[in-house]
Structures are given as structure tokens and as C-alpha cells.
Interface confidence: medium
């Protein structure tokens, strides 16, 4: 789902950030960053290239921008020595994926944006909430959204919908 | 490249179940939907259901329900559907997808006396 | 269950000419309409979802149409590696159903 759909970070609201309890991985998504890990690590060395990075993140859902990747590369192979470890590729990780929505999250996010209690977000809704967030979206990008997540075809995004593109990738 | 490599063919006994899997490569297994379609000599295309890897999320047809038992291993990658009380209406060719892009080769079950 | 329905079993043509291959849906299935080819003793392969969105690596001369209920797969400039039999699927709701299938053959 494109921004529209997304809650404003602290950063555009111009909060401050409190400080966190570190963050955590569930087993389950220690694991799958594994996965990605491993299908960039081919000869099992236990090491990816910093170039590579990108490209694993990417595998895992994330679109880093290149100031976020030169960041990043520099924080964790800061001997320059091309490669990133696994607990490291990890740490990365860990921190990006604990920003992501928790299923009630995704489900109070849900709410705000069916403030008419249909139990559908229609384009009005949509609309209503990217002007509110000041998301400079055209009507043919807010459309293309709800199409994206829209599986039954009938112009709005339910809840299950709306959880599904929120939660996991899909070709359609 | 995504790649789906199905185990081998399988001649079973009526009554019996058969478990055949799916190792998939190339991609994060955990993040796509693994799809599982069944296929009768000469015949059409059957949609059995589906899992999500990532939590074991499932849907079925109902026509499957009962029959079929999706089920993922994310540390060896690999899809398993297990098939029971076979009888011969279940001889056919199954297929894995990823999500129908991406599709295994084919197992084979006969079910025979 | 939505029913996907492909009135022709089989449908004739020659190399160079264009072919369509129709897919009716037993109710409103909006565009969540995916089509597929099939070939003698292979897997299944995706050309075209979203009712009109050609997969990667499939050639242009494969078109998709339709929405609602009824859907067409175009071949234009038929070669003759496109003998196969043809699929349409629905995916607007669970459980996803194909159509019975038309084989193409080559005159």
C-alpha cells in the first residue's frame, strides 16, 4: 500500500521520540531474517557484501533510501571491509522491523480511516485522511491504492483486505 | 531465481495417506502465499487452499477440507501437503505456486490397489 | 462458488492468425481474473492477471480484457509454440476456480 496508508512518523508530526524499550524479534522473524540473510550468504561464509544490503532488505519488504543505505552500511562495516555479518545484518533488522504496525495497530489504523463505520474504507475515506496527513495524492493515486488491496472487487477495502496488504506481500 | 522443486511421484494404497512436499529457493519463503492445485488426467485445474508460511495462516476449499493438510517448514523452506483416506478420485498430478507465478513441477499420486 | 466457464474446449487456427478465447464468470468478479497457459506434460505458467496485466517475460502478441463477468484472452500472431490449453481463474473469492480449460490447436 502507498503512503496514503501509512501513519505519519514522528518525524513529520514533529514529535519527539520517546525513548524505547529495546527492540525485539519474535523467533518467527529472527527467522525469516535468517532467510533473507542466507539466500544472499552463497558460499556460506557467514558474511553478505554491503552492496548486497539493499537488495536482502528488499527482500524482506523494506524500500531504504540511499542516504538511509550509506547510513546504515557505515554504522555496521565500520572496518570497511565490504562484508556485514549476520548479527549485524540482524541488529539492522531488528530495528526496522519493530517500526512496523503490530496487527492492532493495523486495526486502529483501520478505524480512523472508516470514520463512517461501514466497515469498508471507500475513496472518500481515503481521500478525507491523505488530505488530513497533507499526502499530495491524486485521485488516480488514492484509486490505485484501493485497487491494490481491493481482492473482491467491489471498490472498497475491508478489514480482512485491508490486514492482508498491510501484513504480507501478494502478486495479486 | 525462484525456483519450486516438488518430491516425486508417489503409488499409494486406497485408505492410505501420502505427504508430498514442496522446497522452494530464491526468494523469502516466510513472505509469500504458497498455493496448492490439484489436477486430474486430462482435466482441469483445482485450487486446494493455501498457506502463508510466515505465520501458517491457511485458507481451504471446502471441497479439500478434510482431505488436505497444508502445512510449511521455514527453516529447510519447503511446503508439505498431506493427503488422507486416499481413494482413486485423488490420482492426479498436484502442484505447488508461489502465489501462481511460480509454479513446482508436479507431483504424481497414483492410488491403487 | 464462483464459476468460471470457457465455452469452447477447443479452438482452431493457423500460425499468424489472431485468436480469442472467452471466460464468463457466474457473478461479478470485478477484474480479479488471471489466465494461464499450459503445454503437454509441464506445469501451469501465468501470462496474464488482473484481467489485462501481462506477466513478466510474456510476449505482447498475449492480451488480456474484461471485467465482470466476461473475459478474454487475445492471441495475436499466433506461433506455434502457443499450442497449449488455456486456463482463466478467478480470484475475487475463496475458492479461487479455473475454467475447464480450451486447447488450442495449430492448422
Known amino acids: 500500500m502507498a503512503s496514503g496508508f501509512k501513519k505519519p512518523s514522528a518525524a513529520s508530526t514533529g514529535q519527539k521520540r520517546k525513548v524505547a524499550p529495546k527492540p525485539e524479534l519474535t523467533e518467527d522473524q529472527k527467522q525469516e531474517v535468517r532467510e533473507a540473510f542466507d539466500l544472499f550468504d552463497v558460499d556460506g561464509s557467514g558474511t553478505i557484501d554491503a552492496k548486497e544490503l539493499k537488495v536482502a532488505m528488499r527482500a524482506l519488504g523494506f524500500e531504504p533510501r540511499k542516504e538511509e543505505m550509506k547510513k546504515m552500511i557505515s554504522e555496521v562495516d565500520r572496518e570497511g571491509t565490504g562484508k556485514i555479518s549476520f548479527n549485524d545484518f540482524l541488529a539492522v533488522m531488528t530495528q526496522k522491523m519493530s517500526e512496523k504496525d503490530t496487527k492492532e495497530e493495523i486495526l486502529k489504523a483501520f478505524r480512523l480511516f472508516d470514520d463512517d463505520e461501514t466497515g469498508k474504507i471507500s475513496f472518500k475515506n481515503l481521500k478525507r485522511v491523505a488530505n488530513e496527513l497533507g499526502e499530495n495524492l491524486t485521485d488516480e493515486e488514492l484509486q490505485e491504492m484501493i485497487d491494490e488491496a481491493d481482492r473482491d472487487g467491489d471498490g472498497e477495502v475491508n478489514e480482512e483486505e485491508f490486514l492482508r496488504i498491510m501484513k504480507k506481500t501478494s502478486l495479486y | 531465481q525462484v525456483q519450486l522443486q516438488q518430491s516425486g511421484a508417489e503409488l499409494v494404497r486406497p485408505g492410505s495417506s501420502v505427504k508430498i512436499s514442496c522446497k522452494a529457493s530464491?526468494?523469502?519463503?516466510?513472505?509469500?502465499?504458497m498455493n496448492w492445485v490439484k489436477q486430474r488426467p486430462g482435466q482441469g485445474l483445482e485450487w486446494i487452499g493455501q498457506?502463508?508460511?510466515?505465520?501458517?495462516?491457511?485458507d481451504y476449499n471446502g471441497e479439500f477440507k478434510g482431505k488436505a493438510t497444508l502445512t510449511a517448514d521455514r527453516s529447510s523452506s519447503t511446503a508439505y501437503m498431506q493427503l488422507s483416506s486416499l481413494t482413486s478420485e485423488d490420482s492426479a498430478v498436484y502442484f505447488c505456486?508461489?502465489?501462481?507465478?511460480?509454479w513446482g513441477q508436479g507431483t504424481l499420486v497414483t492410488v491403487s490397489a | 462458488d464462483i464459476v468460471m466457464t470457457q465455452s469452447h474446449k477447443f479452438m482452431s487456427t493457423s500460425v499468424g492468425d489472431r485468436v480469442s478465447i472467452t471466460c464468463k464468470a457466474s457473478?461479478?468478479?470485478?477484474?480479479?481474473v488471471a489466465w494461464y497457459q499450459q503445454k503437454p506434460g509441464q506445469s501451469p505458467k501465468l501470462l496474464i492477471y488482473?484481467?489485462?496485466t501481462r506477466h513478466t517475460g510474456v510476449p505482447d502478441r498475449f492480451t488480456g480484457s474484461g471485467s465482470g463477468t466476461d473475459f478474454t484472452l487475445t492471441i495475436s500472431n499466433v506461433q506455434s509454440e502457443d499450442l497449449a490449453d488455456y486456463f482463466c481463474?478467478?480470484?475475487?473469492?475463496?475458492?479461487?476456480?479455473f475454467g475447464g480449460g480450451t486447447k488450442l490447436e495449430i492448422k
Open positions: 530464491g526468494y523469502v519463503f516466510s513472505r509469500y502465499w
Open positions: 481463474q478467478q480470484y475475487s473469492s475463496y475458492p479461487y476456480t
Open positions: 498457506i502463508y508460511p510466515g505465520d501458517g495462516d491457511t
Open positions: 505456486a508461489r502465489e501462481f507465478a511460480y
Open positions: 488482473w484481467a489485462s
Open positions: 457473478q461479478d468478479v470485478g477484474t480479479a
